[in-house]
């Protein structure tokens, strides 16, 4: 399990804000479900909570996770439940509210200050500030000027999809944003969460190619509903 604490990699060396609000509806990228970068500041309350049937976490909002409403209940009946706040018990990251992650069965803080760059990335389309200051160090985060002379090839860094060659889109890939191929039939894709809440995940995928849509994988029987794959399939 992810029992490690936020060490100096996480604190000092976050990916710089590369610009480009990737992962929003209508854009070329889709975020892979599961692990969110800490972010967001609205926490769902019981007052406005409306049960929503689900089969997996990605069908729920960022402030929710998919599970049986009763402890030890029928796994076949699952709804989107309000996320767990700090110091509450958890079994996986998705159960914890934004800004927290699951460590040793407890939701703990991810220290949002150190993730500010990632949060800002989803707010702005362009460089609001080309220096990011973390731990007192000022560092340039601009891309090489060569990026703008030729279209980016697969795997090269980008700011937005227009930086990439034909058949590629600009999508987050863990440390950075790179040009990735538009998805073909049978390839794993990401079904967007409800509420358009998919801007901060660490892996993003391009959209499915023409004539394809992202659907739950057929004949994909497994114990865990929460990690079923979606693939690009013919309409």
């Amino acid at each position: 399990t992810l029992n490690s604490v936020l060490n100096s990699n996480a604190i000092k060396n976050l990916p710089p804000p590369l610009g480009g609000a990737a992962g929003h509806p209508g854009s070329a990228v889709s975020a892979a479900p599961g692990i969110l970068y800490p972010g967001g500041n609205k926490y769902q309350t019981i007052d406005n909570y409306q049960p929503y049937p689900c089969a997996e976490d990605e069908e729920c909002g960022t402030d929710e996770y998919c599970a049986s409403p009763t402890r030890g209940g029928d796994a076949g009946v699952q709804i989107c439940l309000a996320c767990r706040k700090r110091r509450k018990r958890c079994m996986r990251h998705a159960m914890c509210c934004p800004g927290n992650y699951c460590k040793n069965g407890i939701c703990v803080s991810s220290d949002q200050n150190h993730f500010r760059g990632e949060i800002e990335e989803t707010i702005t389309e362009s460089f609001g500030n080309d220096h990011s200051t973390l731990d007192g160090y000022s560092r340039r985060t601009t891309l090489s000027s060569k990026m703008y002379h030729t279209k980016g090839q697969e795997g090269s860094v980008c700011l937005r999809s227009s930086d990439c060659a034909s058949g590629l889109c600009c999508a987050r890939h863990f440390w950075s944003k790179i040009c990735k191929p538009v998805l073909k039939e049978g390839q794993v894709c990401t079904k967007h969460r409800r509420k358009g809440s998919h801007g901060l995940e660490i892996f993003q995928r391009c959209y499915c190619g023409e004539g394809l849509s992202c659907r739950i994988q057929k004949d994909h029987h497994q114990a865990s509903n929460s990690s079923r794959l979606h693939t690009c399939q013919r309409h």
């Epitope: 992810l2 996480a10 692990i35």
Partner: antibody
Framework: QVQLVESGGGLVQPGGSLRLSCAAS????????MSWVRQAPGKGLEWVSV????????YYADSVKGRFTISRDNSKNTLYLQMNSLRAEDTAVYYC?????????WGQGTLVTVSS | DIALTQPASVSGSPGQSITISCTGT?????????VSWYQQHPGKAPKLMIY???NRPSGVSNRFSGSKSGNTASLTISGLQAEDEADYYC???????????FGGGTKLTVL
């Protein structure tokens, strides 16, 4: 075609230093993140470090943090790994790898032996 | 820490299909559906064979395919050939340590 050629490996005593280089060609070096991955004799692969295309971000494995420094010179299409305070357990073949969509191209590696 | 577990060895006869597993936890493989596979022949550099669960880079034979179910990712090689004999490694990322992680490797023997 993409080519990565490592150099600088050799025999060094515990506590010593070594600087590895990786000469890149066949692609726009300044547009890609680059990594070092090592493999101890008869063992599996271990990721060591990565550097962003413009050198603004660097990341390290816990096992080398504070001892190794990754850097690059885009004008020379070269990646570097400065290794200080070397230990016997750092003995390995060190590979330079392009980090496009994952580690999509690798060099042939350079052997670093730390022994007294 | 994230740990990806692979069988130490797998074997098969020419023409057969074999599957190599890579098991993580709900926090990594089961959580964010991302895994890659590398092939390494003795004395050679690793080669990317599969990325993002089931995508093949150009130049990789379609005999190699990837899949994932729950916390386990799999690499399947169909129509096994002598040149497939090599070590295979799965790889993912640790979002807490912001690092890349490799599985322990699986030695494939073609009988």
């Amino acid at each position: 075609q993409v080519q990565l050629v490592e150099s600088g490996g050799g025999l060094v005593q515990p506590g010593g230093s070594l600087r590895l280089s990786c000469a890149a060609s066949g692609f726009t070096f300044s547009s890609y993140w680059m990594s070092w991955v090592r493999q101890a004799p008869g063992k599996g692969l271990e990721w060591v470090s990565v550097i962003s295309s413009d050198s603004s971000s660097t990341y390290y494995a816990d096992s080398v943090k504070g001892r190794f420094t990754i850097s690059r010179d885009n004008s020379k299409n070269t990646l570097y790994l400065q290794m200080n305070s070397l230990r016997a357990e750092d003995t390995a073949v060190y590979y330079c790898a392009r980090h496009g969509i994952d580690f999509d191209h690798w060099g042939q590696g350079t052997l670093v032996t730390v022994s007294s | 820490d994230i740990a990806l577990t692979q069988p130490a060895s797998v074997s098969g006869s020419p023409g057969q299909s074999i599957t190599i597993s890579c098991t993580g936890t709900s926090s990594d493989l089961g959580g964010y559906n991302y895994v890659s596979w590398y092939q390494q022949h003795p004395g050679k550099a690793p080669k990317l064979m599969i990325y993002d669960v089931n995508n093949r880079p150009s130049g990789v034979s379609n005999r190699f395919s990837g899949s994932k179910s729950g916390n386990t990712a799999s690499l399947t090689i169909s129509g096994l050939q002598a040149e497939d004999e090599a070590d295979y490694y799965c790889q993912t990322y640790d979002q807490i340590k912001l690092s890349a992680v490799f599985g322990g490797g699986t030695k494939l023997t073609v009988l």
